[in-house]
Interface confidence: low
């Protein structure tokens, strides 16, 4: 059983390596655009049992402006330099299938993404009315501050409500 | 061009409280989530707080939860970070940065925008 082509998103690109069951890709932002925060540019080849029928997660990818172009004066056509967009990998949490929102980079600066420590999981508190995540961080060699191992942290959000891509905890994104 | 800068650190006894404020320009404010991280000489970098302001959701590390809130004045391109109930373990180099909330890019991945920082000294 095999996935049929992925739905299109706005601003964005997705190139399939695999469209078997369960295989996950990631859509990318086109040159001059970002992944909005809190959205998730991941999709997942999953089965509909009922139907026995394979599709694509829909990804909450929203696609904006980049803000470092907003005001920027466009070049003359032949001076234009656009910077590649290239997948950047997954940073994981402990346990789960759930995909946590991450992003390409489109940035110029050697962008990598910190493995987690073993160990330094946070137990956070959880009250009804406020959604808890346990987040891990990405990394970016960009001068000060000083390039840094990655840790787990909880970020509790005030909204009642989670924030599209923020999931709950013990979800994770494998890929 | 991106700017961010902050201001308000110094040096303030254990139980007292600052405000830090970050000035940004140079995008549109509201299209995207700002936050606060911090880092201590010898230390990893911690995250702080983020706000998305696509929905004024707001996010704080554990550490800091219920002693520190991040505000905006969108109008102003101003993003606010009241300290209070400061802690000597809270010492460290604060900085602003377009980030992103649901997977905490500290200053750099998706966005790699930040300010010059602005220290913060707790003494006890």
């Known amino acids: 059983i095999t996935c049929p082509p992925p739905m299109s998103v706005e601003h964005a690109d997705i190139w399939v390596k695999s469209y078997s069951l369960y295989s996950r890709e990631r859509y990318i932002c086109n040159s001059g655009f970002k992944r909005k925060a809190g959205t998730s540019s991941l999709t997942e080849c999953v089965l509909n049992k009922a139907t026995n029928v394979a599709h694509w997660t829909t990804p909450s990818l929203k696609c904006i402006r980049d803000p470092a172009l907003v005001h920027q004066r466009p070049a003359p056509p032949s001076t234009v330099t656009t910077a590649g967009v290239t997948p950047q990998p997954e940073s994981l949490s402990p346990s789960g299938k759930e995909p946590a929102a991450s992003s390409p980079s489109s940035n110029n600066t050697a962008a990598t993404t910190a493995a987690i420590v073993p160990g330094s999981q946070l137990m956070p508190s959880k009250s009804p009315s406020t959604g808890t995540t346990e987040i891990s961080s990405h990394e970016s060699s960009h001068g000060t501050p000083s390039q840094t191992t990655a840790k787990n942290w909880e970020l509790t959000a005030s909204a009642s409500h989670q924030p599209p891509g923020v999931y709950p905890q013990g979800h994770s994104d494998t890929t | 061009e991106v700017q961010l800068v902050e201001s308000g650190g110094g040096l303030v006894q254990a139980g007292g409280s600052l405000r830090l404020s970050c000035a940004a320009s140079g995008f549109t404010f509201d299209d995207y989530a700002i936050g606060w991280f911090r880092q201590a000489p010898g230390k990893e970098r911690e995250g702080v707080s983020c706000?998305?302001?696509?929905?004024?959701?707001?996010y704080y590390a554990g550490s800091v939860k219920g002693r520190f809130t991040i505000s905006s004045d969108n109008a102003k391109n101003m993003v606010y970070l009241q300290m209070n109930s400061l802690k000597v373990e809270d010492t460290a180099v604060y900085y602003c940065a377009i980030l992103d909330c649901a997977v905490v890019t500290t200053l750099g991945g998706e966005y790699d925008y930040w300010g010059q920082g602005t220290q913060v000294t707790v003494s006890s």
């Open positions: 706000m998305d302001s696509s929905d004024g959701s707001t």
